[in-house]
Interface confidence: medium
């Protein structure tokens, strides 16, 4: 569809509320340091301009592309050079280079203060005083901290945020009603952001073929009754949606996502029996529901795959005629039969199958050469199965906090050059796999665990790319998307690492430790643990456990003392000396 005015087209399609929300998200994700009021001003100017184009599509500048309009608007920010440094150079470029330049300057770890949650009464007053501003502030604060957040999904989070306040600010016990809802939104939001970041990394670093392969596998698991051509249609449309959102084209992305939801709901019969309850919901909820929908039941009469992909004499002929389609059909057929496998495992199997065909179809006797290809899958399948089994046993034995600590030690030994805050963040999140996945039935454990780990390890890769310090991390992150997790799992103690010099300051603690929340206390202790391992990478589990137990006892003792600060000042150096002796 060609429209005289793209901005008018999107305004009409999306409606004013969603249009304004998406433009605010787009601007906040590009200019992450700009004050809220500045962004609101820019959004209002764009919205007023869009309205003039709706009234007259031939009006001046209405024919310009959205990138041109939005880029021009961003480049009017007066403090661009002072606030963003070299990002201001983007404004000297022409489209499409200017937009690419803005994208490259998105910061996954912006230097922004953690969001502090005010008192419930303060929040409710702000909500009632100016609901629109309150919700815009939410979009702004989330978007600037998560510059790749899936924009149409962020509108859904904002709608839930609004509903929570509308309900709970009327409740007798506002806090009891609101705080659990806000906690849930925060946790779900962080998970959603991390999942989308992997999709964007997949598209940007490995190309749309990698993303399409992921989508074929995942959608074939979800919709095992759908034809291959149907799955392919959904994959093509979904790839367009995510390519747009990852590229900053948020209006097009939201519009196309709505079209995809409409298509799925109009074609439920050829997709899945599970879509019905999603399709009765309003747009934002419907799209979210469709994205999260459970796997449909597998057809009962699926024949063996071996007939078409191993035993057939036409395997090489079919492969040669259209490699990507044949491999796509193989992946579709394998995935729809294996909802119990992780998507990453399915992609490894497809890769192994492709490698075998590349080798065997050039051999003297191709059929003889590829006859045992499915046997070669066995070790690939067993590796993640064993990993999940061992780690779930460890999680059940230790509990979440100590399981996180085991992972902190494991990963610090593998890649000690990585910054301590990154190791703590990533290992804590890796450790959450236990509570998330280990309680599930056997058939759901691997897809839950390995695909979650892929998301968490992508965060490590994204942070490391910004400040590269380890060749091992770079290698695991860049060589193969599907083999990232096995690559990290296979890393051993870095023998080349020169231990970090001991710094007593790192292990000096104060009375403020006692007022921290349980989570903040854990982070402090885990930070110390990482520093210990960096100082003594060859320390045994027993040595580290001894030091950490002493640390916990020391903190507990001083937090019970009358003069806490004096206790920390006196007991701290003793703890440090005892720790050094224990690790000598």
């Amino acid at each position: 569809d060609t429209h005289k005015s793209e901005v008018a087209h999107r305004f009409k399609d999306l409606g004013e509320e969603h249009f304004k929300g998406l433009v605010l998200v787009a601007f906040s994700q590009y200019l992450q340091q700009c004050p809220f009021e500045e962004h609101v001003k820019l959004v209002n100017e764009v919205t007023e301009f869009a309205k003039t184009c709706v009234a007259d599509e031939s009006a001046e500048n209405c024919d310009k592309s959205l990138h041109t309009l939005f880029g021009d608007k961003l480049c009017t920010v007066a403090t661009l050079r002072e606030t963003y440094g070299e990002m201001a150079d983007c404004c000297a470029k022409q489209e499409p280079e200017r937009n690419e330049c803005f994208l490259q300057h998105k910061d996954d770890n912006p230097n922004l203060p953690p969001l502090v949650r005010p008192e419930v009464d303060v929040m409710c007053t702000a909500f009632h005083d100016n609901e629109a501003t309150f919700l815009k502030k939410y979009l702004y604060e989330v978007a600037r901290r998560h510059p790749y957040f899936y924009a149409p999904e962020l509108l859904f989070f904002a709608a839930r945020y609004k509903a929570a306040f509308a309900e709970c600010c009327q409740a007798a016990d506002k806090a009891a009603c609101l705080l659990p809802k806000l906690d849930e939104l925060r946790d779900e939001g962080k998970a959603s952001s991390a999942k989308q970041r992997l999709k964007c990394a997949s598209l940007q670093k490995f190309g749309d073929r990698a993303f399409k392969a992921w989508a074929v596998a995942r959608l074939s698991q979800k919709f095992p009754k759908a034809e291959f051509a149907e799955v392919s249609k959904l994959v093509t449309d979904l790839t367009k949606v995510h390519t747009e959102c990852c590229h900053g084209d948020l209006l097009e992305c939201a519009d196309d996502r709505a079209d995809l939801a409409k298509y799925m709901c109009e074609n439920q019969d050829s997709i899945s029996s599970k879509l019905k309850e999603c399709c009765d919901k309003p747009l934002l909820e419907k799209s979210h529901c469709l994205a999260e929908v459970e796997n449909d039941e597998m057809p009962a009469d699926l024949p063996s795959l071996a007939a078409d992909y191993v035993e057939s004499k036409d395997v090489c002929k079919n492969y040669a005629e259209a490699k990507d389609v044949f491999l796509g059909m193989f992946l579709y057929e394998y995935a729809r039969r294996h909802p119990d496998y992780s998507v990453m495992l399915l992609l490894r199997l497809a890769k192994a199958y492709e490698a075998t065909l590349e080798k065997c179809c050039a051999a003297a006797d191709p059929h003889e050469c590829y006859a045992k290809v499915f046997d070669e899958f066995q070790p690939l399948v067993e590796e993640p199965q064993n990993l999940v089994k061992q780690n779930c046993e460890l999680f059940e034995q230790l509990g979440e906090y100590k399981f996180q600590n085991a992972l902190l030690v494991r990963y610090t030994k593998k890649v000690p050059q990585v910054s301590t805050p990154t190791l703590v963040e990533v290992s804590r999140n890796l450790g959450k796999v236990g509570a998330k996945c280990c309680k599930l039935p056997e058939a759901k454990r691997m897809p839950c665990a390995e695909d979650y780990l892929s998301v968490v390890l992508n965060r490590l890769c994204v942070l490391h790319e910004k400040t590269p310090v380890s060749e091992k991390v770079t290698k695991c992150c860049t060589e193969s998307l599907v083999n990232r997790r096995p690559c990290f799992s296979a890393l051993e103690l870095d023998e080349a690492y020169v231990p970090k010099a001991f710094n007593a300051e790192t292990f000096t603690f104060h009375a403020d430790m006692c007022t921290l929340s349980e989570k903040e206390k854990q982070v402090k202790k885990q930070t110390a643990l990482v520093e210990l391992v960096k100082h003594k990478p060859k320390a045994t589990k027993e040595q580290l456990k001894g030091v950490m137990d002493n640390f916990a006892a020391f903190v507990e003792k001083c937090c019970k003392a009358d003069d806490k600060e004096a206790c920390f000042a006196e007991e701290g150096p003793k703890f440090v000396a005892a720790s050094q002796a224990a690790l000598a």
Epitope: F228, E230, K233, T236, D314, M329
Partner: nanobody
């Protein structure tokens, strides 16, 4: 009863063009993915192109990519194949077929239309 009727074949010189049509009846065309397959003299069936029920996406065999275009008109229950830059090796009987629910097999196909590329 499913019926697929191909037309538009004929003799054409190398580098020339042809447009094949396939009229479908007896099934719900607009919910069916369709494809073109061909059989060269003395050879097996080779699939040429697939089109989803909605018109996108489309897929092509590597041997025809960039030269052939598959399309459909659901209001007329008709499938098309525009063939440009024809080569001698494109000589074959072309069949339109209803795409299968899976695997490289075809549920129904027509009687075919012969395309001969020769100078």
């Amino acid at each position: 009863e499913v019926q697929l009727l191909e037309s538009g074949g004929g003799l054409v010189q190398p580098g020339g063009s042809l447009r094949l049509s396939c009229a479908a009846s007896g099934f719900t065309f607009d919910t069916s993915s369709m494809l073109w397959v061909r059989q060269a003299p003395g050879k097996g069936l080779e699939w040429v192109s697939v089109i989803h029920q909605s018109g996108t996406p489309t897929y092509y065999a590597d041997s025809v990519k960039g030269r052939f275009t598959i399309s459909r008109d659901n209001s007329k229950n008709t499938l098309y194949l525009q063939m440009n830059s024809l080569r001698a090796e494109d000589t074959a009987v072309y069949y339109c077929a209803k795409f299968p629910s899976s695997r490289m097999k075809f549920d129904y196909w027509g009687q075919g239309t012969l395309v001969t590329v020769s100078s």
